[in-house]
Interface confidence: low
C-alpha cells in the first residue's frame, strides 16, 4: 500500500509507504504535509525506513525538510529534521504514534522522499549470551538470508583479564553505497563494542562485504548488535570467537 497524499492519518494494518506527493519526481513548491502514523495496539511501536532515493533541497534544512516526532503531534519528542540527498536512518517510536511533517518553500525542488512504515518487531529470539571459552556467533538463519527488522544483541562474557579474539569467516550485509565509503551503514549493520553495547569503547560499525577482520577485546566482555531494516536481506555473518588467557591471569593459575 502506498500513500502519496499530502498528509493523512495512517492506522497501520500492514506495512506500507507514504511519500512526498509526486515522488520520485519533483515535489511542488509551498507544501506543508503532515502524517500521523498510528499502531493498532497501544503497546506496539512503529518503525520507519527512508528509501535511499531521498532528495530534498539542502540548505541547512531551512527551506525544504522532513521532520519526525515521536508522538501524536509536533509536541512529541523531536527525532530529527532531514534534508539533502542522504536518507535519514531508520526511526523507531517509543510508543504507538509517529508524526511526520514535510515542508517545502517556493523554489528549488528535489525528488522528495518515500517512507516505509511498519510495526516494529524484534528478531525471533536472536539475542544471545556466550560464556564458553570458544564458540560460533551467527546471524539468524545463516547462511540463508537474515530476516528484516532485527535488533539482535550478542554478548560474550569471559573471565576478567582474558582477551577475546573474534574472527569472521563470512560477512555479507546490505551495503550502504552512498559516499563516503559506506561509512554510514544506514540500512543493515553490525556494531561491535569492547564492553557492553553503547557503554564500552566502540570498536566499529560494519556493513557490506568488507569483513571486519580480527577483533580483540581485553575487557572480558565483547558485545555485538546486529540491526536490519525492512528491506534487502543478505546472507549475514558467521564469526568464531576464542578466549586467550592474558599473562596476568596466567600468573594466578
Amino acid at each position: 500500500f502506498r500513500n502519496d497524499k499530502c498528509g493523512d492519518t495512517i492506522k497501520i494494518e500492514s506495512p506500507g509507504y507514504l511519500t512526498s506527493p509526486g515522488y520520485p519526481h519533483s515535489y511542488h513548491p509551498s507544501e506543508k504535509c503532515e502524517w500521523l502514523i498510528q499502531a493498532p495496539d497501544p503497546y506496539q511501536r512503529i518503525m520507519i525506513n527512508f528509501n535511499p532515493h531521498f532528495d530534498l533541497e539542502d540548505r541547512d534544512c531551512k527551506y525544504d525538510y522532513v521532520e519526525v516526532f515521536d508522538g501524536e503531534n509536533e509536541n512529541g519528542h523531536f527525532r530529527g529534521k532531514f534534508c539533502g540527498k542522504i536518507a535519514p536512518p531508520p526511526v523507531v517510536s517509543s510508543g504507538p504514534f509517529l508524526f511526520i511533517k514535510f515542508v517545502s518553500d517556493y523554489e528549488t525542488h528535489g525528488a522528495g522522499f518515500s517512507i516505509r512504515y511498519e510495526i516494529f518487531k524484534r528478531g525471533p529470539e536472536c539475542s544471545q549470551n556466550y560464556t564458553t571459552p570458544s564458540g560460533v556467533i551467527k546471524s539468524p538463519g545463516f547462511p540463508e538470508k537474515y530476516p528484516n527488522s532485527l535488533e539482535c544483541t550478542y554478548i560474550v562474557f569471559v573471565p576478567k583479564m582474558s582477551e577475546i579474539i573474534l574472527e569472521f569467516e563470512s560477512f555479507d550485509l546490505e551495503p550502504d553505497s552512498n559516499p563516503p565509503g559506506g561509512m554510514f551503514c544506514r540500512y543493515d549493520r553490525l556494531e561491535i563494542w569492547d564492553g557492553f553495547p553503547d557503554v564500552g569503547p566502540h570498536i566499529g560499525r560494519y556493513c557490506g562485504q568488507k569483513t571486519p577482520g580480527r577483533i580483540r577485546s581485553s575487557s572480558g566482555i565483547l558485545s555485538m548488535v546486529f540491526y536490519t531494516d525492512s528491506a534487502i536481506a543478505k546472507e549475514g555473518f558467521s564469526a568464531n570467537y576464542s578466549v586467550l588467557q592474558s599473562s596476568v591471569s596466567e600468573d594466578f593459575k
Epitope: R2, D4, K5, C6, P21, G22, Y23, P24, H25, S26, H28, P29, P52, H53, D55, K85, H109, G110, A111
Partner: antibody, heavy 115, light 107 residues
Framework: EVQLLESGGGLVKPGGSLRLSCAAS????????MSWVRQAPGKGLEWVSS???????YYAESVKGRFTISRDDSKNTLYLQMNSLKTEDTAVYYC?????????WGQGTLVTVSS | DIQMTQSPSSLSASVGDRVTITCRAS??????LNWYQQKPGKAPKLLIY???SLQSGVPSRFSGSGSGTDFTLTISSLQPEDFATYYC?????????FGGGTKVEIK
C-alpha cells in the same frame, strides 16, 4: 539558456538496439532529475523513463526490462539504451528536464522500428 | 495507473475567443497537474505547473485552475500563435501520465 539536444535515433529492425543521447547545457545538469518522453506518429505523449539526481531509475511498464536510462554528469549527458525494440516503440523520443514538471524539452529524435 | 481524460479532443475557435480545455483524473491528484502546448513538428512547452502556476515566460492569457480530479486550462483571448495541441499531465504518482490532447484549430 537551457538546451537539450537528442541524438542517436534512426531506423532499426524489430529486435534491434539503439542508444539515444541527450546533451544538456545552460544549467547544472547534476542538480536535476531527467526523463525520456516519447510520441508515436500522430499520437499523444507517453512517459518512458526517469532518472533521479542520484541515479535511481524509473520505467514505464511498456519498456521495463528492455530500456535502460543512465546519466553521465561529467559529460552533462543523458542516455537511453533501447534493446529488443518493437514496432510499437516507433516514436519521436524527447529528453526533458524534471523541474516542477517537464520544464524543458529537447527537439526530439525519431526512432523507427520496421522490418 | 492514473488515467487522464481531456476534453474536447479538438475545438475550432477564432482569434480573441476565450477557450477552455478540461482535464479529468481517474483519482484525486491534489494539484499535481501540468499543462503543455505543442505545435506541429516541435517539442512540447510547459505552460502551467501545479494546476495554476504560470511557467516563467508564458503569457498571462494562459491560466489554470482545479484541484482533486477536475482541472481547466483557459486561454482568455486566443492569439494566432496559440493554435496548437494542448496536453495535461499528472505528476502525482508514477507512471506519469498525459491526457490524450486537445487540438485548437482556427475556425
Amino acid at each position: 539558456e537551457v538546451q537539450l539536444l537528442e541524438s542517436g535515433g534512426g531506423l532499426v529492425k524489430p529486435g534491434g538496439s539503439l542508444r539515444l543521447s541527450c546533451a544538456a547545457s545552460g544549467f547544472t545538469f547534476s542538480s536535476y532529475a531527467m526523463s525520456w518522453v516519447r510520441q508515436a506518429p500522430g499520437k499523444g505523449l507517453e512517459w518512458v523513463s526517469s532518472i533521479s539526481r542520484t541515479g535511481y531509475t524509473y520505467y514505464a511498464e511498456s519498456v521495463k526490462g528492455r530500456f535502460t536510462i543512465s546519466r553521465d554528469d561529467s559529460k552533462n549527458t543523458l542516455y537511453l539504451q533501447m534493446n529488443s525494440l518493437k514496432t510499437e516503440d516507433t516514436a519521436v523520443y524527447y529528453c526533458a528536464r524534471v523541474g516542477t514538471a517537464f520544464d524543458y524539452w529537447g527537439q526530439g529524435t525519431l526512432v523507427t522500428v520496421s522490418s | 495507473d492514473i488515467q487522464m481524460t481531456q476534453s474536447p479532443s479538438s475545438l475550432s475557435a477564432s482569434v480573441g475567443d476565450r477557450v477552455t480545455i478540461t482535464c479529468r483524473a481517474s483519482q484525486s491528484i491534489s494539484s499535481y497537474l501540468n499543462w503543455y502546448q505543442q505545435k506541429p513538428g516541435k517539442a512540447p512547452k510547459l505552460l502551467i505547473y501545479a494546476a495554476s502556476s504560470l511557467q516563467s515566460g508564458v503569457p498571462s492569457r494562459f491560466s489554470g485552475s482545479g484541484s482533486g480530479t477536475d482541472f481547466t486550462l483557459t486561454i482568455s483571448s486566443l492569439q494566432p500563435e496559440d493554435f496548437a495541441t494542448y496536453y495535461c499531465q499528472q505528476s502525482y504518482s508514477t507512471p506519469l501520465t498525459f491526457g490524450g490532447g486537445t487540438k485548437v484549430e482556427i475556425k
